[in-house]
């Protein structure tokens, strides 16, 4: 009864924003759903969540620590995160729940996506001391 989800295993981010796509083995337009993105090996932090169905675009809400938005088509939910920092580097898991009508359905836990935020190094040109 579980839905399968495909995520990219690794996203390396040079800028401070990223788009993470979650592709599901189920038609998202069939039922009212709740799509969420979790951070951490134990999915401790709900980063972003949105509800949607075939008649309206979801409003995505983010955890206070994150800025997020999202979009979906009939098989993919895409989360966009911005203002990311080095300490946001972690593993992220997509989750989908089909809330109503019954039966309730959700996805098998995927292997997740490691989002690696690269540190920005500022290059300072040092002038040699004058003798």
């Amino acid at each position: 009864n579980k839905i399968l989800v495909k995520q990219s295993p690794l996203l390396v981010v040079d800028s401070n924003e990223v788009s993470l796509s979650c592709r599901y083995s189920y038609n998202l337009l069939a039922k009212e759903f709740r799509a969420s993105l979790y951070k951490g090996v134990n999915s401790d932090v709900e980063v972003c969540v949105g509800n949607g169905n075939f008649t309206y675009q979801p409003q995505f809400r983010s955890n206070a620590e994150f800025n997020c938005d999202g979009d979906f088509d009939n098989e993919t939910v895409t989360f966009r995160l911005w203002n990311l920092h080095v300490n946001h580097t972690d593993i992220y898991f997509c989750k989908i729940e089909f809330m109503y009508p019954p039966p309730y359905l959700d996805n098998e836990r995927s292997n997740g996506t490691i989002i690696h935020i690269k540190e920005k190094h500022l290059c300072h040109t040092q002038s040699s001391p004058k003798l």
Partner: antibody, heavy 116, light 107 residues
Framework: EVQLLESGGGLVQPGGSLRLSCAAS????????MSWVRQAPGKGLEWVSA????????YYADSVKGRFTISRDNSKNTLYLQMNSLRAEDTAVYYC?????????WGQGTLVTVSS | DIQMTQSPSSLSASVGDRVTITCRAS??????LNWYQQKPGKAPKLLIY???SLQSGVPSRFSGSGSGTDFTLTISSLQPEDFATYYC?????????FGQGTKVEIK
């Protein structure tokens, strides 16, 4: 803490109308389907109606179809049940319930008595 | 609609007894079966969801099993506060339907 608080019950004559309300707090109301479940005196639980999180889809038991209307106001975190053409057999305690995988939270119920 | 049949409709038991209540669906509902406890004058309380998952805060003496059409709620050692009415409910196909209830009384 999740809380559901029903109101609007009372005594009404057959053929009359009532509007029940259920004020929700402690969870993201718009994310969850909500239901009304009733219990006639000394009887078991009977599902009455449900509405999806967005309010876009509604469902009714055959016994109330065409007479009851479920709705929700997500901006006010409130669920409603408009009951028209009430009959003696609608006499019951009406519970609102949050529906996730199951009915995981219930209100305390409001009594509707239909009698002349 | 899917019909849910509980048995027995009532039973008498003593504190410490192992109690088993069964619920049968008129067609397969996979594991979409939930159990509730209700005490007089109170709202129902979720005990078990998805056939065997214990709801947070519910004592571990309650357990559920089964899939398809046949399900069981077991109370391993009945406590004084467990005397109540128990309902099964299927969530596999709309509309949601409940069993008729099983009243657990003191012997």
């Amino acid at each position: 803490e999740v809380q559901l608080l029903e109101s609007g019950g009372g005594l009404v004559q057959p053929g009359g109308s009532l509007r029940l309300s259920c004020a929700a707090s402690g969870f993201t109301f718009s994310s969850y389907a909500m239901s009304w479940v009733r219990q006639a005196p000394g009887k078991g639980l009977e599902w009455v109606s449900a509405i999806s999180g967005s309010g876009g889809s509604t469902y009714y038991a055959d016994s109330v179809k065409g007479r009851f209307t479920i709705s929700r106001d997500n901006s006010k975190n409130t669920l409603y049940l408009q009951m028209n053409s009430l009959r003696a057999e609608d006499t019951a305690v009406y519970y609102c319930a949050k529906r996730y995988i199951a009915f995981d939270y219930w209100g305390q119920g409001t009594l509707v008595t239909v009698s002349s | 609609d899917i019909q849910m049949t509980q048995s027995p409709s009532s039973l008498s038991a003593s504190v410490g007894d192992r109690v088993t209540i069964t619920c049968r669906a008129s067609q397969s509902i996979s594991s979409y079966l939930n159990w509730y406890q209700q005490k007089p004058g109170k709202a129902p309380k979720l005990l078990i969801y998805a056939a065997s998952s214990l709801q947070s805060g519910v004592p571990s003496r309650f357990s559920g099993s089964g899939s398809g059409t046949d399900f069981t709620l077991t109370i391993s050692s009945l406590q004084p506060e467990d005397f109540a009415t128990y309902y099964c409910q299927q969530g596999g196909m709309p509309p949601d339907t409940f069993g008729q209830g099983t009243k657990v009384e003191i012997k």
